[in-house]
């Protein structure tokens, strides 16, 4: 099952995806698509990187992490209910059957409407428990529900990112675990890739 992430209408949504470059600067092409990962490539591509930069994106989709270190987490700006659904992060490792693919489920909730306060605003009521992930802007928050187990493959940097952020504590609180898996590997076209 997909890992589920939540955001409110009007917020920025954050969908994490990481890999470890074989060497500094040795980037791997990555694509993000709307919809579950197909056999090849990404369907409905919203953003793509190559060996040097972000070379394709559509409005509201961008990378706010250090993609040159393998943080290819997707930010979706100012989400609407229509942004709900499955997103595919595909790490296009050169060679046959080497691609890593991750399906992430984004759930968008209607924005909370709070009555105009007569006195001081009650921030606890207006803003439920949120977390801001390290290295991302203040508007980029993810409302914590009960997070399911995270089913990702051999990507050690995710654990490092989690350990470095407040998310680690929140994941521990929710009982989530990080499991390795090999069932996401697939056959894919060969990709031209150079070391640099």
């Amino acid at each position: 099952s997909e890992v589920e992430y939540r955001a409110e209408v009007g917020q920025n949504a954050y969908l994490p995806c990481f890999y470890t470059p074989a060497a500094p600067g040795n980037l791997v092409p990555v694509c993000w698509g709307k919809g579950a990962c197909p056999v090849f490539e990404c369907g409905n591509v919203v953003l793509r990187t190559d060996e040097r930069d972000v070379n394709y994106w559509t409005s509201r989709y961008w990378l706010n992490g250090d993609f040159r270190k393998g943080d290819v987490s997707l930010t979706i700006e100012n989400v609407t209910l229509a942004d709900s659904g499955i997103y595919c992060c595909r790490i296009q490792i050169p060679g046959i059957m080497n691609d890593e693919k991750f399906n992430l489920k984004l759930v968008i909730k209607p924005a909370k409407v709070t009555p105009a306060p007569t006195r001081q605003r009650d921030f606890t009521a207006a803003f439920p428990r949120m977390l801001t992930t390290r290295g991302h802007g203040p508007a980029e928050t993810q409302t914590l529900g009960s997070l399911p187990d995270i089913n990702l493959t051999q990507i050690s940097t995710l654990a490092n990112e989690l350990r470095d952020s407040r998310l680690a504590n929140d994941l521990r609180d929710s009982g989530a675990t990080i499991r390795g898996s090999s069932d996401y590997k697939d056959d894919d076209d060969k990709h031209h890739h150079h070391h640099h």
Epitope: P24, G25, D53, V54, T75, H194
Partner: antibody, heavy 121, light 107 residues
């Protein structure tokens, strides 16, 4: 230490071509993109394109793609930038520069001293 | 192409003043902004990369902040040797583009 040493100043007539060289030392030449950036007198910086020496793959700024060719000679760790069909507004200082993550993810950023190319009839 | 709009184009400040330069990207560029210093007749020198990271050997009075589209470069206490033109550059998507520059002078 890392050094990028460029060829000397050139004066060219409109319509001619110029080839600027950039000799690298002090690092593994094939590991980093070599960029070319120009600066017209009193103006800002403009990226022209880059090349990765290990396979010759290059990417050019659309503005220059029909007139520029970037090459490398890995045996001498030298990069070249040739600009054709020169016009007076190509008068500028041309820099080679290399940047990117190096070992331990330390950012690597070095520039040549610049080559003044003057286009005048 | 991503446009980088830098402001102000020039400023004059006194030694010891705090100096702030802003750079606005036409589209989000994540953290991939660099700041360069260029003195007359010299090559650009990297000060900040990845929006906030100080390049090797650069004094700590220089700092950068921001992500997405809005970035700020700060000199906490202006020194006479800081007289130069400063450029921002995006390294998110090629063609890499530079801001128009900010010339910093001493009052």
């Amino acid at each position: 230490q890392v050094q990028l040493v460029q060829s000397g100043a050139e004066v060219k007539k409109p319509g001619a071509s110029v080839k600027v060289s950039c000799k690298a030392s002090g690092y593994t030449f094939t590991d980093y993109y070599m960029n070319w950036v120009r600066q017209a007198p009193g103006q800002g910086l403009e990226w022209m394109g880059d090349i990765i020496p290990n396979n010759g793959g290059s990417k050019y700024n659309q503005k220059f793609k029909d007139r520029v060719t970037m090459t490398t000679d890995t045996s001498t760790s030298t990069a070249y930038m040739e600009l054709r069909s020169l016009r007076s507004d190509d008068t500028a200082v041309y820099y080679c520069a290399t940047w990117g993550y190096g070992s331990s993810y330390r950012w690597f950023d070095y520039w040549g001293q610049g080559t003044l190319v003057t286009v005048s009839s | 192409d991503i446009q980088m709009t830098q402001s102000p184009s020039s400023l004059s400040a006194s030694v010891g003043d705090r100096v702030t330069i802003t750079c606005l990207a036409s589209q989000p560029i994540g953290i991939w902004l660099a700041w360069y210093q260029q003195k007359p007749g010299k090559s650009p020198k990297l000060l900040i990369y990845a929006a906030t990271s100080l390049a090797d050997g650069v004094p700590s009075r220089f700092s950068g902040s921001g992500s997405g589209t809005d970035f700020t470069f700060t000199i906490s206490s202006l020194q006479p040797e800081d007289i130069a033109t400063y450029y921002c550059q995006q390294l998110y998507s090629s063609p890499w583009t530079f801001g128009g520059g900010t010339k910093v002078e001493i009052k």
